[in-house]
Interface confidence: low
């Protein structure tokens, strides 16, 4: 709370406007108006997404109207920075107190249409963990007071399990909502169909998505694993590559193991399934390993989990960084 | 033309900004700054879509700095009015002349239902064929009688070449429109910016996309090529894999050669660039080859074309199906 012997400033950001056609100018000026305070030392700092900006500010000299002073500080931004949805804050320090105002590009008033997607369980969850889940994903929602409802049903009419819901605000200002439903392993394998219904006051009609076990021919994956040779300037790390191909259907889980321990998924990067020239699918998986790891045990395993693989729905291939040693 | 005996005013509209979440305030203030004129009578009028507004303007008293005067006039609008896409003009009459500035709500940077993308030239077209092109792609258009217009310009103001246009109806009923523009190799390398403007009767406003050479650090790709061993039941074909990694920027072209002849792009499948754990990117490329090919000449080349590769922007690696023979 400010003490009574000074009048604190009002901080307000104004911005240069778009032209008569609604087009953004090449540069955007933010003008921080610090007004109506008892004359005294003030310090103005600009922040970008909470970080102090190292900028050459064009701060106008302070003007005085009667007993109160005003100062303004201008920040010039490129159109690219402004359109990248960063938040800019004008932070004023005065008499040991901080006053601020923040701004960012106004959210689109007419955002892109809503899309809904319904996933199948991952083969890993289905066959290894034996606790399959399916996820209904709704993207590009405009944040609003209206609630998004995601409700589940089964084609058989049998009751569904309890689902868990998650909402996430994206950087672009839209809302992403997911609902994850545990499904019975046997129900799924026997071909049950699950439906996700999405309703929202701004949707003209409900969105319905359904998912079931993929039909059609089955083929087990072939798994090949390779290690890259040493490359100049990177003696202490190597890349391992795994090619998994000619499998059907396209649902597959890829894991890497070292020392009989499964490495975290974040360690590797696996491509989305793509069609081969024939009727199957393929993926690549890439893992970076360190000298410490291969010196501890020079055997890394690439494992594919797929419904057509036997035994026990897995196929794996071992690879070494230095196979000759 | 103004006579010499007075300095005319500069007219500029500033507006109140959206908050740190990008939300519009309940009311929007437009501030018309009329500055730097020789003191004299001025008249300020606000127009809405060209019509004089009957408003009670809060026009601040004129201030004088040295020999020049400044005046400001503020217009307060409801959020609804501002969001209805009307154009507001601050019109200043002074010494028998009219000076004005106009503004409206900034166009949505990504209007609903339609997305526009503007590609950079492929390194192959840029460095090998030396006939680079850029493509403006508009997707998710609702088919209608109204024409989608894609027009090109350059930041330098120089004329653009003749573009070619293609329309394609998608399975989901939407329309995809592309416009391909040949660009000068030297212009591109020297950093010219190209703009594609998309207009359509059903778009609330024009979409603008721009492209230019990627800035930032450069790193040449590492290229590794592998052949899969024989797999039961497929004696007469093999898969070749190429891992290209740690390159920057992400623009890359991948080719396969056999017998010193480049194989058609349709023969191989190459993933989109993905980030490595470090600062670079990686891709995988997959090629299926037949016994007839490897018996004719058992050497296949995976070639990467990338701006940081030297010499001549290419790095390649040879691989054989039967390396020992």
């Amino acid at each position: 709370v400010c003490s009574r012997d000074f009048t604190p400033p009002t901080v307000k950001i104004l911005q240069s406007s778009c032209d008569g056609g609604g087009h953004f100018p090449p540069t955007i000026q933010l003008l921080c108006l610090v007004s109506g305070y008892t004359p005294g030392t003030i310090n103005i700092t600009w922040l970008e997404d909470g970080q102090v900006m190292d900028v050459d500010l064009s701060t106008a000299s302070t003007t005085q109207e009667g007993e109160l002073a005003s100062t303004q500080s201008e920040l010039t931004l490129s159109q690219k920075h402004w359109l990248s949805d960063r938040t800019y804050t004008c932070q004023v320090t005065y008499q040991g107190h901080t006053f601020e105002d923040s701004t960012k590009k106004c959210a689109d008033s007419n955002p892109r249409g809503v899309s809904a997607y319904l996933s199948r369980p991952s083969p890993f969850d289905l066959f290894i963990r034996k606790s399959p889940t399916i996820t209904c994903l709704v993207v590009d929602l405009a944040p609003s007071k209206g609630t998004v409802n995601l409700t589940w049903s089964r084609a058989s009419g049998k009751p569904v399990n309890h689902s868990t819901r998650k909402e996430e605000k994206q950087r672009n200002g839209t809302l992403t909502v997911t609902s994850t439903l545990p499904v019975g392993t046997r129900d799924w394998i026997e071909g049950e169909t699950y439906q996700c219904r999405v309703t929202h006051p701004h949707l003209p009609r409900a969105l319905m998505r359904s998912t079931t076990k993929t039909s059609g021919p089955r083929a087990a994956p072939e798994v090949y694993a390779f290690a890259t040779p040493e490359w100049p300037g990177s003696r202490d790390k190597r890349t391992l590559a795994c090619l998994i191909q000619n499998f059907m259907p396209e649902d597959i889980s890829v894991q890497w193991l070292h020392n009989e321990v499964q490495l975290p998924d974040a360690r590797h990067s696996t491509t989305q399934p793509r069609k081969t020239k024939g009727s199957g699918f393929f993926v690549f998986s890439r893992l970076e390993v360190t000298r410490a790891e291969w010196e501890q045990k020079d055997e890394f395993i690439c494992r594919a989990v797929h419904e057509a693989a036997s035994p026990s729905q897995t196929v794996q291939r071992a690879v070494s960084v230095n196979p000759g040693k | 033309v103004c006579s010499r005996d007075f300095t005319p005013p500069t007219v500029k509209i500033l507006q109140s900004s959206c908050d740190g979440g990008g939300h519009f305030p309940p009311t929007i203030q437009l501030l018309c700054l009329v500055s730097g004129y020789t003191p004299g009578t001025i008249n300020i009028t606000w127009l809405e879509d060209g019509q004089v507004m009957d408003v009670d303007l809060s026009t601040a008293s004129t201030t004088q700095e040295g020999e020049l005067a400044s005046t400001q006039s503020e217009l307060t609008l409801s959020q609804k009015h501002w969001l209805s896409d009307r154009t507001y003009t601050c019109q200043v009459t002074y010494q028998g002349h009219t000076f004005e500035d106009s503004t409206k709500k900034c166009a949505d940077s990504n209007p609903r239902g339609v997305s526009a993308y503007l590609s950079r030239p492929s390194p192959f077209d840029l460095f090998i064929r030396k006939s680079p092109t850029i493509t403006c792609l508009v997707v998710d258009l609702a088919p209608s009688k109204g024409t989608v217009n894609l027009t090109w310009s350059r930041a330098s103001g120089k004329p653009v070449n003749h573009s070619t246009r293609k329309e394609e109806k998608q399975r989901n009923g939407t329309l995809t429109v592309t416009s391909t523009l040949p660009v000068g190799t030297r212009d591109w390398i020297e950093g010219e910016t190209y703009q594609c403007r998309v207009t359509h009767p059903h778009l609330p406003r024009a979409l603008m996309r721009s492209t230019t050479k990627t800035s930032g650090p450069r790193a040449a790709p590492e290229v590794y090529a592998f052949a899969t061993p024989e797999w039961p039941g497929s004696r007469d074909k093999r898969t070749l894999a190429c891992l290209i990694q740690n390159f920057m920027p992400e623009d890359i072209s991948v080719q396969w050669l056999h017998n010193e002849v480049q194989l058609p792009d349709a023969r191989h499948s190459t993933t989109q660039p993905r980030k490595t754990k470090g600062s670079g990117f990686f891709v995988f490329s997959r090629l299926e080859v037949t016994r007839a090919e490897w018996e004719q000449k058992d050497e296949f080349i995976c070639r990467a074309v990338h701006e940081a590769a030297s010499p001549s922007q290419t790095v390649q690696r040879a691989v054989s199906v039967n390396p020992g023979k």
């Epitope: 007419n110 249409g113 405009a142 009609r205 | 609903r112 609702a142 209608s144 009688k145 009923g173 059903h202």
Partner: antibody, heavy 121, light 111 residues
């Protein structure tokens, strides 16, 4: 330019049946758009009746569902409205129309000249 | 179903007059900033003709004296300066939700 021409209207007794045709020229009904029937009782307003999408899917106004069937003959580039169990309140001018699609919504952009159906004993 | 109520049901006006017709929906016909309200003109013995789509977008070939505005549940069709060929019946229509519905019509007659 697309043109729509209705035919098949006339006088029919209550409980009777009638099939209206809409012949389309200048555009294939399987290429795109939604194709509509809309009616207008004498001196009254407009009422949307039924539609057939270029992909063959159909929609009906709940007020007529069960008595009315929309269909098409691709080889003749014609779509139809089969009306059964006709009542006096079905008396109207029946228009066929082509709807323009916009992200799951449609409006009636091109209309035929209309054909009069009178249900009376 | 969404009910649309037009007012007035009829009006008499002279050439050059400014005419305003309103249409009120029983629920909002807006979706993500798009207004799913259309306006049609019908002359005696003729099929309706689409004038305005999405609340305010003039169909090509429609004179600029016609304009549409509004959002949510309240929409307006305005003829800025009535011409002899504008005497007709005007209908609003919502395409936000199936079944698509029309207003009961507003007849614009010569005074």
């Amino acid at each position: 330019e697309v043109q729509l021409v209705e035919s098949g209207g006339g006088l029919v007794q209550p409980g009777g049946s009638l099939r209206l045709s809409c012949a389309v020229s200048g555009y294939s009904i399987t290429s795109g758009h939604r194709w509509e029937w809309i009616r207008q009782a004498p001196g009254k307003g407009l009422e949307w009746v039924a539609s057939i999408h270029y992909d063959g899917s159909t929609n009906y106004n709940p007020s007529v569902k069960g008595r009315i069937t929309i269909s098409r003959d691709d080889s003749k580039n014609t779509f139809y409205l089969q009306m059964n169990s006709l009542r006096a309140e079905d008396t109207a001018v029946y228009y066929c129309a082509r709807a323009t699609h916009y992200f799951g919504h449609h409006h009636f952009a091109v209309w035929g000249q209309g054909t009069l159906v009178t249900v009376s004993s | 179903d969404i009910q649309l109520t037009q007012s007035p049901s009829s009006l008499s006006a002279s050439v050059g007059d400014r005419v305003t017709i309103t249409c009120r929906a029983s629920q909002s016909v807006d979706y993500h900033g798009d207004h799913y309200m259309n306006w049609y003109q019908q002359k005696p013995g003729k099929a309706p003709k689409l004038l305005i789509e999405w609340g305010s977008y003039l169909r090509s070939g429609v004179p600029s004296r016609f304009s549409g505005s509004g959002s949510g549940t309240d929409f307006t069709l305005t003829i800025s300066s009535l011409q002899p060929e504008d005497f007709a019946t005007y209908y609003c229509q919502q395409n936000a939700e199936d079944p698509y519905t029309f207003g009961q019509g507003t007849k614009v007659e010569i005074k």
